[in-house]
């Protein structure tokens, strides 16, 4: 019991810190105008992965993509390449979990394999937190090392942008909901690996068991079975659960609405 | 055509106070900032302030942050603007003027004089 | 506060002629974000309230005529008349819309001979 709440409790905490890293990748505020030194400005920037922002006062705001590859900073670039690592492994991490769950049976799915499983999502969440936590940490220290360098009409590390002598960026939101995301799938991956050791299935000895036969004496020692294989002549002590037959027509996967973003 | 229609000419006394009122029409009142401007007679422009009809929230220009209160009224699409403790230094023409692309007053009423005189 | 300096403080101009008239910032009003200048021009005709004519330095309000230019970036602005009509008599005005509080030039005032 103890085994199957920490393994779902983990697949919860990851799938949340997924969505997490995924809401962080693709908000604009990962770089957020600093009004600390210079509250008087109508205009106030942001900037992204992807874009960078104006709000005017007025309400009005305008988004620019970056439509280079190649004059983009190097550092911007391997964020973004740390972001989407995450977000496949995690993903590839949550679609593995999901067949290793103790709670859902898969035809006649052994339980060494979904222990297997279980250890292999647990470490896909683990790397894919790490790499939330490092793509935003290299794009926060990417934000102090510019913070003082923001003088007029030089290139900083946010999209190549021109910047003048009062803009100066400091962390945006998208920072501390990466940080959070990244430190949840890297929980999760953590009990998905503790969960894992409770579904192994531990070898069972049977202590020796002396039959006396007439004229041998003759010990029997049964050497120590998987309870879960199911092979060999102890079959009668497992449990065999069908899960229904079903055809294959009847095993239709329907796409949700997430299919076409 | 967007449309602000302001209160008619006042003649207060020094000391009392006065509220301009700035009717918009034909467009999303919420969705725009409406500004408020000072024009003295043969003067420049002076900007007095903003306020976001929307959330009611305001942002004055320091030199008339004790003059001058701002307020809108969501149901009536009517922004107001107050003025107190008057004194001759305060008669001029206020206009309202909606926000508009660049923080620029895109859009704007005829006007409100407002005569200070005892 | 920013101040705008505006310059001629009046011209007198013939139809048809070409007119330049300048507006220059104590402080750059060029935002690093989107590279646009927070500079407007205004034109108010006597007894009227003003009237947009260009904002981002450049950008043409619609339905203003294409003779009025604004151009200039920073510090450094300029409205042109290309070819200045007797209903162009009016007192223009730049306005700062970078920095709080907004500030508007003292006004150039046009007249026709």
């Known amino acids: 019991m103890a085994v199957t709440a920490c393994q779902g409790l983990g697949f919860v905490v990851s799938l949340i810190g997924i969505a997490g890293i995924i809401a962080a990748t693709c908000m604009d505020q990962w770089s957020t105008q600093d009004l600390y030194n210079n509250p008087v400005t109508a205009v106030f920037n942001y900037q992204g992965l992807w874009r960078s922002c104006v709000r005017e006062s007025s309400g009005f705001t305008e988004c620019r993509g970056y439509f280079t590859l190649l004059g983009l900073p190097a550092m911007l670039q391997a964020v973004r390449a740390l972001m989407i690592v995450g977000i496949v492994l995690g993903a590839i991490g949550l679609l593995v979990s999901i067949f290793a769950l103790k709670c859902i049976r898969i035809g006649s799915m052994e339980d060494s394999a979904k222990a297997n499983m279980t250890l292999t999502s647990g470490i896909m969440f683990i790397v894919s937190g790490l790499c939330a936590i490092a793509g935003v940490s290299v794009f926060a220290n990417m934000l102090v090392t510019n913070f003082w360098m923001s003088t007029a009409n030089m290139y900083t590390g946010m999209g190549g942008m021109v910047q003048t002598v009062q803009t100066r960026y400091t962390f945006g939101a998208a920072l501390f909901v990466g940080w959070v995301a990244g430190g949840l799938t890297l929980i999760g991956g953590v009990m998905m690996c503790i969960a894992c050791r409770g579904l192994a299935p531990e070898e069972t000895n049977y202590k020796a068991v002396s039959y006396h036969a007439s004229g041998h004496s003759v010990a029997y020692k049964p050497g120590g079975f998987k309870a879960s294989t199911g092979f060999g002549s102890n079959t009668k002590n497992k449990k065999i659960y069908d899960g229904g037959a079903r055809t294959e027509d009847e095993v239709q996967s329907y796409p949700s609405k997430h299919d076409y973003v | 055509e967007v449309q602000l229609q302001q209160s008619g000419a006042e003649l207060v006394r020094p000391g009392t106070s006065v509220k301009v009122s700035c009717k918009a029409s034909r467009y999303a009142f919420t969705n725009y900032l409406i500004e408020w401007v000072k024009q003295r007679p043969g003067q420049g422009l002076e900007w007095i302030g903003m306020?976001?009809?929307?959330?009611?929230?305001?942002h004055y220009n320091e030199k008339f942050k004790v003059k001058a209160t701002l307020t809108a009224d969501k149901s009536s699409s009517t922004a107001y603007m107050q003025l107190s403790s008057l004194t001759s230094d305060d008669s001029a023409v206020y206009f309202c003027?909606?926000?508009?692309?660049?923080?620029?007053?895109?859009?704007w009423g005829q006007g409100t004089l407002v005569t200070v005189s005892a | 506060d920013i101040l705008l300096t505006q310059s001629p403080l009046s011209l007198t101009v013939t139809a048809g002629e070409k007119v330049t008239m300048s507006c220059k910032s104590s402080?750059?009003?060029?935002?690093?974000?989107?590279?646009?200048?927070?500079l407007t021009w205004y034109q108010q005709k006597p007894g009227q309230p003003p009237k947009l004519l260009t904002y981002w330095a450049s950008t043409r309000e619609s339905g203003v005529p294409v003779r009025f230019t604004g151009s200039g970036s920073g510090t450094d602005f300029t409205l042109t008349i290309s070819s200045v009509q007797a209903e162009d008599l009016a007192v223009y005005y730049c306005?700062?819309?970078?920095?709080?509080?907004?500030?508007f030039g003292g006004g150039t005032k046009l007249e026709i001979k």
């Open positions: 306005q700062n819309g970078y920095f709080y509080p907004y500030t």
């Open positions: 306020i976001n009809p929307g959330s009611g929230g305001t």
């Open positions: 003027a909606r926000g508009g692309f660049g923080n620029s007053f895109a859009y």
């Open positions: 402080q750059s009003l060029l935002n690093g974000g989107n590279l646009k200048n927070y």
